[in-house]
């Protein structure tokens, strides 16, 4: 009976979420059949988050809106391990907006979800950031340093990376 009602609830949630994401990929977390964590298909998952690489070229603001419409934000990178996961899905000849900006041009970098900016967990290319007028951050590949961050003008269209918490049903 308990299992039946749990399944009914889960199906009802899935139906509700299908309005926003037509397909979800779910996995059972741990040994407890009660806990399913889901990401929209074809997003990828790492730890407790889902990631989507948006290949449309848009400004930083439009990229963030594109993410938020899907229930996500431009990516906030918290660890080296997270960045190492993300770059597996990126193309070396492209640049991707991060959820990191310096709106005032005073080198007060801030993450879109208000995660505190920690200088010790940043992955800027050497010599970056280097321009007060370049107020948005991208991740790109440089042959000398591999993947790292660079500051650029926010209006210049780029690809982007969206991130959201896993959906629990």
């Amino acid at each position: 009976n308990f299992m039946y009602s749990k399944t009914v609830k889960r199906l009802s949630k899935l139906r509700e979420y299908q309005q926003y994401h037509p397909s979800l990929t779910c996995v059972m977390e741990g040994k407890d059949i009660e806990d399913w964590s889901c990401c929209p298909t074809p997003w990828t998952s790492f730890q407790s988050s889902c990631y989507f690489i948006s290949t449309g070229m848009q400004s930083w603001t439009k990229s963030q809106k594109n993410c938020s419409v899907m229930g996500a934000d431009l990516v906030v990178i918290n660890t080296r391990e997270e960045q190492d996961f993300i770059i597996q899905n990126l193309k070396r000849n492209s640049s991707y907006f991060l959820g990191l900006s310096d709106p005032g041009g005073r080198r007060h970098w801030q993450w879109v979800d208000q995660t505190p900016y920690n200088e010790n967990v940043t992955f800027w290319h050497s010599g970056e950031p280097n321009n007060l007028d370049e107020r948005c951050a991208i991740i790109n590949f440089r042959s000398s340093e591999e993947w790292g961050w660079n500051d650029i003008h926010c209006h210049v269209p780029q690809k982007s990376i969206c991130k959201m918490k896993k959906i629990y049903i």
Epitope: Y20, M70, Q114, K165
Partner: nanobody
């Protein structure tokens, strides 16, 4: 797409109360966290209050805490802002905003995280 329409603004005296409403149309309202923001002439848009999809979590700007109350009625697809003890510095255009959220306790205080915005309703406060 979600369309938002604010109402309830007007001209009042300092110390009075107002109830602002924001009606949503389009997609299922219950999947959206909601927020109120305001903008006074010559000033930047400022966060006022936010509420989670379920209504279980709310958060307020320090300047309005204890005087403003945000609430929602998912059946009526509406969010409300009850404003008490109005001050002259509360005069502004008030905007409601919506953002899809799959976490029923999450709330959002940053304007950039909202996808949909209303046209605003004017609140004028005279002393």
């Amino acid at each position: 797409q979600v369309q938002l329409q604010e109402s309830g603004g007007g001209s009042v005296q300092a110390g009075d109360s107002l109830r602002l409403s924001c009606a949503a149309s389009g997609r299922t309202f219950s999947g959206y966290a909601m927020g109120w923001f305001r903008q006074a002439p010559g000033k930047e848009r400022e966060f006022v209050a936010t509420i989670s999809t379920s209504g279980s979590s709310t958060y307020y700007a320090d300047s309005v805490k204890g005087r403003f109350t945000i609430s929602r009625d998912n059946a009526k697809k509406s969010v409300y802002l009850q404003i008490n003890s109005l001050k002259t510095e509360d005069a502004a255009v008030y905007y409601c905003a919506a953002r899809l959220s799959f976490d029923n306790t999450a709330f959002y205080t940053s304007a950039i995280r909202y996808s949909y915005w209303g046209q605003g309703t004017q609140v004028t406060v005279s002393s």
